[in-house]
Interface confidence: low
């Protein structure tokens, strides 16, 4: 679709005569009829196949035509067409005299024609005007013409329809040849495909508008290059979505099982030494003067029963003081003024004289102790139970009631689920509070490393000389397919250079 435009510029009819030679009275009131048709080698009468247009009266005898004539006429004259411009044409321009106001052909006398010109030729679509001048014996017409495309039509023949748009169906403007030119940020044949944020991961990200980066399930981050770990993963990371690879010191499916309680929680107080002893379990070794599972209790100086021979201990700000019973003296009541004659041994203890009767020693029955067998044995005072075990006096002996996961006389042994080596194929076993976990070597998976998975034996690029590497899935080994001219299990030897073997 386009328009043939004709710009009339000047008409000269100095004598004011008609084509017949007869003069116009009082002058030639001139208007024009234009006929545009297909190319004819000899322009002949017949239908104006490309269109016709008429002007109003533009002037008398000789006159210049203004760019946009008043009186309803338009200059340039417009001859629209709605087909592909063929590139060739024929043009007939007739100048007529209008004696009255009725310009219809049937209202004019047959000899009202002033002049007639006919041209034909090639004309390419373009913005430039072609200037032409046609002269007859009595008249001269100067005019210019061109063909331009209608709005939204482009190309050499005005045959390419292109309407700029910026909506769901495309984001583009039109180039002079009718090709689309995408607006920045859009690409694709019809400029419907947004160009995502620079660096947006090609597989894991996408966008619905330019400079955007929306993440596919399992991915996050500005460029969708960070995986999302398994929901509930506490102390772990991922390299592919929904993984939970535990940080050091953590175990379990969600890496929420503390394998390094000492470091993560520092439970031991007052400078005690902490030792991990399994999942969420630890032992504190107290410094002198402290006691309790976490060494949180400060021992009074008297707690160690420093006073001998039934002496009573009194705490003081700077230490302690022993109040000795009759017959004893010394810092700890360790010196006796008694002998066996004084029956110093209590609770059925036997007295033995020493140093020729100057001193004595008591031999105590079971469950009693002290210089004079005056103390009942409390076998729990030394806090012998490890790992938070509870100490119980049971008559002549004591026993430890262990916390879950521990055993042994003193709860010193961790009940190990790993003791029976449950992890197959050389997997490493970790004891957890409520079970165990296997860390599998490369090539194995499953709860007990019982499932063989494929190892890519070609990952280390073992083949030389551009050989092709194949993985044998049944044996997890590689096979090298050598290019022409090379041999060897890794294609390492050129043909013709036999390998030098040591034998």
């Amino acid at each position: 679709s386009g328009v043939f435009q004709l710009q009339l510029q000047e008409f000269i009819n100095e004598r004011g005569v008609l084509a017949s030679g007869r003069p116009c009275e009082p002058g030639c009131r001139t208007f024009f009829r234009v006929c545009l048709k297909h190319f004819q080698a000899v322009v002949s009468p017949g239908p104006c196949t490309f269109g016709t247009v008429s002007t109003p009266v533009l002037g008398t005898n000789s006159f210049a035509v203004r760019d946009d004539s008043s009186g309803g006429g338009r200059n340039p004259l417009q001859l629209p067409f709605n087909f592909t411009w063929p590139g060739t044409f024929s043009l007939i321009i007739e100048a007529w005299h209008a004696p009255g106001d009725d310009l219809r052909p049937e209202a004019l006398p047959p000899d009202a024609l002033i002049s007639k010109i006919a041209i034909q030729g090639s004309l390419a679509v373009g913005q430039n005007w072609l200037l032409d001048e046609q002269t007859s014996t009595l008249t001269r017409l100067r005019y210019s013409y061109r063909v331009i495309c209608s709005d939204n039509y482009y190309g050499d023949n005005c045959s390419r329809l292109c309407k700029k748009r910026n909506d769901h169906f495309g984001h583009y403007v039109c180039q002079p040849d009718g090709n689309l030119s995408c607006l920045p940020g859009w690409t694709g044949e019809y400029c419907q495909q947004p160009i995502c944020l620079s660096g947006c991961h090609e597989q894991n990200g996408y966008c619905s508008k330019p400079a955007e980066c929306l993440c596919r399930p399992g991915w996050q981050g500005r460029l969708c290059n960070e995986c999302i770990p398994h929901n509930g993963c506490r102390h772990g990371t991922c390299s592919t979505p929904w993984q939970c690879t535990c940080d050091e010191g953590w175990g379990g499916l969600f890496c929420d099982q503390d394998l390094n309680y000492c470091t993560h929680h520092s439970p031991c107080k007052n400078g005690a030494t902490c030792s991990n002893s399994g999942q969420r379990s630890y032992t504190c070794t107290c410094r002198p003067g402290y006691t309790g599972v976490d060494c949180e209790l400060e021992l009074s100086e008297c707690d160690s029963n420093p006073c001998r021979n039934g002496g009573s201990c009194k705490d003081q700000e700077d230490g302690y003081h022993c109040l000795c019973p009759p017959g004893y003296y010394g810092l700890h009541c360790e010196h006796s003024t008694l002998s066996c004659a004084d029956s110093p041994c209590f609770n059925g203890g036997s007295c033995r004289e020493r140093n020729q009767g100057a001193n004595y020693a008591c031999e105590c029955p079971p469950n009693f102790t002290g210089s004079n067998c005056e103390k009942k044995v409390d076998r729990c005072t030394s806090n012998p139970c490890a790992n938070g075990g509870q100490c119980l006096n049971r008559g002549p002996s004591r026993m430890c009631r262990c916390r879950p996961g521990f055993t042994g006389t003193y709860c010193e042994l961790h009940v190990s689920d790993c003791a029976r080596n449950p992890c197959a194929h050389g997997g490493t076993c970790h004891d957890l509070e409520n079970g165990l976990m296997c860390t599998c070597p490369a090539g194995f998976s499953g709860r007990r490393c019982e499932v063989r998975t494929s190892i890519d034996a070609c990952a280390s690029s073992p083949c030389f000389n551009r050989a092709t590497c194949y993985t044998d899935l049944s044996t997890d080994t590689f096979v090298c397919n050598c290019p022409y001219g090379f041999v060897g299990s890794r294609c390492e030897f050129p043909v013709g250079l036999p390998p030098s073997f040591p034998w």
């Epitope: 090709n179 689309l180 920045p184 940020g185 044949e189 400029c191 090609e202």
Partner: antibody, heavy 119, light 108 residues
Amino acid sequence: QVQLVQSGAEVKKPGASVKVSCKASGYTFTYYGISWVRQAPGQGLEWMGWISAYDGNTNYAQKLQGRVTMTTDTSTSTAYMELRSLRSDDTAVYYCARYSWNKHWFDPWGQGTLVTVSS
Amino acid sequence: EIVLTQSPGTLSLSPGERATLSCRASQSVTGSYLAWYQQKPGQAPRLLIYGASSRATGIPDRFSGSGSGTDFTLTISRLEPEDFAVYYCQQSAFSPWTFGQGTKVEIK
């Protein structure tokens, strides 16, 4: 006719910056993008990135990210490429080239700017 | 990143002979986004073929492009003296846009 004219040759010391200009004429500057391509001596062509003259949107090659900045001045129809922290392996001829948003080929090309990085 | 591998690296031919240059992509590329360029010593590259097979304005019809997917070919039907140069293929289907390493066509 459509033409891209680049600024003249530059000699720079390692660690310095260089800014190359590319002046466009003969077409509507904002309807197209400008891409930058470099060529080290005796080597092939390496794409550096593009900038939209329409809105300044950019896309840089990953290996140059953080060192390169591409800008445009629509009032003068000029594109600029700045490369910072220059190294000796940045010695190359730097070309600008026009491309259309749905036709990502380069036509025409600027005449090239030689940037030499040497201590 | 898509790697474009051109072969051969160098092609030694005489004027009048036919030249066939290959460009292989490491993954499938839409033909619309593959172009060929010619570069002569000391000059900027010049667009020859775009969209895998369309000749750029002013390029003689002895140059033709073909191919799709991962294999593309530039053919020069009869070499003229001015055709001896380096030829590069380029893809813009995926970012980063990449060039092949080039094929040098030299006089035998």
